[in-house]
């Protein structure tokens, strides 16, 4: 077994976790995750590795002269689901009630607040981690009287005697004291999208303003897609 550094056979390749150094023309050791090459190999000495410094990382076996910088702190509309360590970059995902409008390789670059459907409109398609809520007008016989990113259109209560007929944004009002319903009373909620990652991480101080991110998108309730029919 050859020990690094060594000259590869003509036309041969270096082994796993080794790289070919063009200057030394030798197979040399790579540095493991969490470390980087402090001194490159020569014909007589192998790579010298050093640990990644604060807020930098390497995830793979490498021979980079400097570790990669961890991404900036998560903005106020995000949660840190993976902390920056020597071996992994920080991952930011959107808070509940927000979705990822612009993703990056891992985590989210830009979060936007989930659209809220206004009265007369209900959720046709719930928001996910990466897609916004789709609203639809409540069909005849159904209503929604809330501004919500989770409420769907609910059936009007069925009255023996109608005092005020229902419309898209209001339930029917009965004169009798015992209305019946095709569904149980109370708002019907769709679940909020939740992050699939549950890794506990140490807190990272977040800046008071999101650095150059969510100001591009409305931070209040988004106007509903009123012309939308859902699909």
């Amino acid at each position: 077994v050859a020990f690094t550094p060594y000259a590869p056979e003509p036309g041969g390749t270096c082994r796993l976790r080794e790289y070919y150094d063009q200057t030394a023309q030798m197979c040399c050791s790579k540095c493991p995750p969490g470390q980087h090459a402090k001194v490159f190999c020569t014909k007589t000495s192998d790579t010298v590795c050093d640990s990644c410094e604060d807020s930098t990382y390497t995830q793979l076996w490498n021979w980079v002269p400097e570790c990669l910088s961890c991404g900036s702190r998560c903005s106020s509309d995000q949660v840190e689901t993976q902390a920056c360590t020597r071996e992994q970059n920080r991952i930011c995902t959107c808070r509940p009630g927000w979705y990822c409008a612009l993703s990056k390789q891992e985590g989210c670059r830009l979060c936007a607040q989930l659209r809220k459907c206004r009265p007369g409109f209900g959720v046709a398609r719930p928001g996910t981690e990466t897609s916004d809520v789709v609203c639809k007008p409540c069909a005849p016989g159904t209503f929604s009287n809330t501004t919500s990113s989770t409420d769907i259109c609910r059936p009007h209560q069925i009255c023996h005697v109608v005092a005020i007929p229902g419309n898209a944004s209001m339930d029917a009002v009965c004169t009798s004291t015992s209305p019946t319903r095709s569904m149980a009373p109370g708002a019907v909620h769709l679940p909020q999208p939740v992050s699939t990652r549950s890794q506990h991480t140490q807190p990272t101080p977040a800046p008071s303003t999101a650095p150059g991110t969510s100001f591009l998108l409305p931070v209040g309730p988004s106007p509903p897609a009123e012309g939308s029919t859902g699909d």
Epitope: P32, S51, T85
Partner: antibody, heavy 118, light 106 residues
């Protein structure tokens, strides 16, 4: 509760070597890097080096390079620090400390007093 | 190596006092870390990532700073806070510690 229990006090003569052990319990040993930090009497803390048990790689403080060797035995979750050619200014309390892959020492060992005296 | 200079090196204050310890770095650092050490004991992590309190640290402690100047503040000194405090950086290899600030209760 993560614990790092170190070996007992040592009295050594100048020129000798010392090997201090640090046994870890209650965590996955290879998931955490092990650092060694020493503290001379009445002095501040001095980082000596780090070992990455997962990969067996090490990095040492320049001033101790060539005199210190860090090793681990993953089967017993034990880290070792050997310091050779001891001098009187090596008299100190030696601590092992994990860093959890971050940049501070979150769990410290019980400490081992090494006295170098003729 | 980055040198960390702590001031003051010794501090005597009364219970209830507001106390500030400063750590100056010879070069800019990303974050500062602080430890508390009592005689005959191993150091305990006290503040990490400049301003986050380690588990079990009372809320009267706080950390702040950036670049080359960082501070540890105790808003209302308590008897159990008597100890030596060390700052530490790892923005550059090797990691280095400050010279320590010994805090005594009057």
């Amino acid at each position: 509760q993560v614990q790092l229990v170190q070996s007992g006090a040592e009295l050594k003569k100048p020129g000798a070597s010392v090997k201090v052990s640090c046994k870890a319990s209650s965590y996955s040993f290879t998931d955490y890097n092990m650092n060694w930090v020493r503290q001379a009497p009445g002095q501040s803390l001095e980082w000596m080096g780090i070992i990455f048990p997962k990969y067996g790689t090490t990095s040492y403080a320049q001033k101790l390079q060539g005199r210190v060797t860090l090793t681990t035995d993953t089967s017993t979750s034990t880290a070792y620090m050997e310091l050779r050619s001891l001098r009187s200014d090596d008299t100190a309390v030696y601590y092992c400390a994990t860093d959890g892959g971050t940049w501070y020492f979150d769990v410290w060992g019980t400490g081992t007093t090494v006295t170098v005296s003729s | 190596d980055i040198q960390l200079t702590q001031s003051p090196s010794f501090l005597s204050a009364s219970v209830g006092d507001r106390v500030t310890i400063t750590c100056r770095a010879s070069s800019s650092v990303t974050y500062m870390y602080w430890y508390q050490q009592k005689p005959g004991k191993a150091p305990k992590p006290w503040i990490y990532l400049t301003s986050n309190l380690a588990s079990g640290v009372p809320s009267r402690f706080s950390g702040s700073g950036s670049g080359t100047e960082y501070t540890l503040t105790i808003s209302s000194l308590q008897p159990e806070d008597a100890a030596t405090y060390y700052c530490q950086q790892w923005s550059s290899n090797p990691p280095t510690f400050g010279s320590g600030t010994k805090l005594e209760i009057k």
